[in-house]
Every structure is written in structure tokens, then in C-alpha cells.
Interface confidence: medium
Amino acid sequence: ASGTEAAAATPSKVWGSSAGRIEPRGGGRGALPTSMGQHGPSARARAGRAPGPRPAREASPRLRVHKTFKFVVVGVLLQVVPSSAATIKLHDQSIGTQQWEHSPLGELCPPGSHRSEHPGACNRCTEGVGYTNASNNLFACLPCTACKSDEEERSPCTTTRNTACQCKPGTFRNDNSAEMCRKCSRGCPRGMVKVKDCTPWSDIECVHKESGNGHNI
């Protein structure tokens, strides 16, 4: 595994509509979205992480649109905007301006934004605080993940992509150690030779000395 994408785990609580259910991929790490959007440090504090198998990951849950006509009710039912609304109003939280944006999907907000409490309007996510990486009907952006203490940030959270975290140098995470970064092995057993260095996604690789380590490795 390249370690850049997490395996699917329990989805966060999300809103759904007849346009399809949208859920983040890679495990629930966000709080229940509300109609208020996210503001300031409180959103960062909400960026907790649920346990579950997660190899070295691009911390971003990917939004998947399931083409199922199922209503997901989590406390409140989504008010569906008529599909004829091909143009939506976009409220920019960060600079307080409004702009109109054409939306080919009609009632869905574009990546980097979420559904406003005002029908037909979308709010921009705040850089470094929240994100959405697909067209969506969420009432709040997904909170950016904070890298764990044994990880370092590979790329920062943007409005359309979650933080990418990886194990710190000298440690790795793979399918067998999904929850934590493990120390890289110091060397190979007797009779074997190292053919690949440790990476954030894999331990060193050893082959038998007699195998010929310049070929097919």
C-alpha cells in the first residue's frame, strides 16, 4: 500500500438527500455537522479521530456519492433545494463577501464549500480549519485532521483536501501496524541483505544474500 489513502471505516455523521448519500471515506474524524458551519479554533478541536484500521494515510476522508435514493436522518432532515436551481449563492466565510457560482449539479455545493442554512447558498470552508473534497450537501465542512504526535504533516489542509500525515523519519506504518508508527528495523538478519530503506509506509526490505539483490527487486 502506498499509504496515501486510508481504508474505509465507519463514516462520519453526514446529511443525505435524494441526490445521494455523501460520506467521508477513511473513518469518522469529524464532529456532527451543524447548520452553523465551522469557526475558529473550536473546529480544529473537533478534529478528533475514531479508531480503526488506518495505514499511513492521507488524512483526508474522500467523499463518496452513493447512488442510493436513501434519506439519512441525523437529528434534522435536509431541506432539498429544487434541482432547477442551477446557480447558487456562495458565502465566503473567510472574507465576508458573497459570490454567485454556477453549479452543474444544481442542489450540491462544490468542493471547498458546504450547504448554507440559506436555501440555494453555499459557505466556503475556512482554509486550515475545514474542507470538503467533493460536491456535497453537508451543513458543515469536515474538520481538518491534526497529525498525531508520532506523525509529521506531509501537506497542509486546504479547503478541498484534508491534512496528509505520515510517520516521522525512522518510523513506518503499514497494513500490519495501522494505528501507530513503528520503529524501523536496524538491519537484516544474518544471511540477508537490505535492498530497500525504511519509508514512512514500509520497513526496510531484506533479501537472501544468495538471491542476487540487483535483480527483480
Epitope: R190, G191, V193, K194, H208, K209, E210, S211, G212, N213, G214, H215, N216
Partner: antibody
């Protein structure tokens, strides 16, 4: 261009110690994956592997002859040595040194040095 | 110590495909035996053909290939040529040492 060349005494008497030298060029024994083996061939017969030394000074020996063999190397002078103690007539053979390279095979061979053990 | 057995002699014709095999007295040959194949031509000219069961070294013609067939290691020459007439030795690795077979004399008529 990889070359290997063996040298030895030619003739020994039983119970003496055989000292063989393999001088090579075209590769370095400090390179990971490299190694040199000693192999012998009695006249008209098959091959018998004797010993191997790796780039990291790890060594392997033929179990049947282990107590009599000692392999060593001088990386800086590109030489590998083999000592066989207490020789007898059964050790009469042509002795080859061969490189084991990165493809895991005995790829380059010397032309051999002949030993006759005779009283 | 294990014994490695090869056909003592085989004959083939130019252009034909011929397979030489290498059997171990200690059971099936596996990739952990890192089967090697060495060619000996007249005047004690040795060339390593195959290492690690199927790794063909640079410079070795593509008609030579190594594999495992059943419980044996095999060297296949696809489209034998007259210059392939030689003695072929296989060698198997047993945990910490090599054992050579007795060699197969291949005649290309």
C-alpha cells in the same frame, strides 16, 4: 571488464597447507551483493564448491571440509585467499575462484590453478 | 549432505528446445535453493548462466531460461545452437552451502 586469476603452489606434499590467492579486477568486494567463491574440479570430474566470502566479510564453507578451510579477503588489494590444511591426494584438482554478482549467479570465473598432491 | 542429480547426457538438434533438470535428494527444489546454472566449454571455460532460479545475467542469450518444473530445477534452451554444446552444471543452496550436480553433457547434432 571483470577478470579473476588464481595462483597457487602447483605441487604439495600430503599434510602440507595449501594457500591459494584470487586476484580480481573490474569489481569491488566492498560493493553490496558481491562475493567470491572457491570451487574445485578434480580431473575429469564434476565441480565441488568449497567456500564463499561476502562483501561484508560473512563466510560460508562446505560442511564436509569446514574444519580444514579458511577463506579471507583483502578488499583494498582486490584479493581473496583460501587456505586448506592437511592436504592429501584427494585434494588434487584445478581450483577456481568465481564471482557471485548481483544476479545471484557464479557469473565470472578465473582460468584455474592446478594443484597436485604427491609424496 | 544433500546430493544433486542431473542427467548425465542429452542430445538435441539445432533449433530444437531442450530442458535439463536438477534434482535434490532432500526433496523438492524450491526458490529457496536459488538454483544456479553454469556452462563449461572446452579448455575449462566457465560461464554463469542463471542465478536465483530464473535470473538470467546480462550477456547471456535469451534462449537460456531457468525455472522450476515439478520438484526439480530446470534449464531450458529454446532453439539450441551448435555453440551450446557444453557441459551444464546446476548448483543448489542448502541453508549455508552450495552443492553442485554432476553435470549434463549436452550434444547439439
Amino acid at each position: 571488464q571483470v577478470t579473476l586469476k588464481e595462483s597457487g603452489p602447483g605441487i604439495l606434499q600430503p599434510s602440507q597447507t595449501l594457500s591459494l590467492t584470487c586476484s580480481f579486477s573490474g569489481f569491488s568486494l566492498s560493493t553490496s551483493g558481491m562475493g567470491v567463491s572457491w570451487i574445485r574440479q578434480p580431473s575429469g570430474k564434476g565441480l565441488e564448491w568449497l567456500a564463499h566470502i561476502y562483501w561484508d566479510d560473512d563466510k560460508r564453507y562446505n560442511p564436509s571440509l569446514k574444519s580444514r578451510l579458511k577463506i579471507s579477503k583483502d578488499t583494498s588489494s582486490n584479493q581473496v585467499f583460501l587456505k586448506i590444511t592437511s592436504v592429501d591426494t584427494a585434494d588434487t584438482a584445478t581450483y577456481y575462484c568465481t564471482r557471485r554478482g548481483e544476479y545471484g549467479n557464479f557469473d565470472y570465473w578465473g582460468q584455474g590453478t592446478t594443484l597436485t598432491v604427491s609424496s | 549432505q544433500a546430493v544433486v542429480t542431473q542427467e548425465s547426457a542429452l542430445t538435441t538438434s539445432p533449433g530444437e528446445t531442450v530442458t535439463l533438470t536438477c534434482r535434490s535428494s532432500s526433496g523438492a527444489v524450491t526458490t529457496s535453493n536459488f538454483a544456479n546454472w553454469v556452462q563449461e566449454k572446452p579448455d575449462h571455460l566457465f560461464t554463469g548462466l542463471i542465478g536465483g532460479t530464473n535470473n538470467r545475467a546480462p550477456g547471456v542469450p535469451a534462449r537460456f531460461s531457468g525455472s522450476l518444473i515439478g520438484d526439480k530445477a530446470a534449464l531450458t534452451i529454446t532453439g539450441a545452437q551448435t555453440e551450446d554444446e557444453a557441459i551444464y552444471f546446476c548448483a543448489l543452496w542448502y541453508s549455508n552451502h552450495w552443492v553442485f550436480g554432476g553435470g549434463t553433457k549436452l550434444t547439439v547434432l
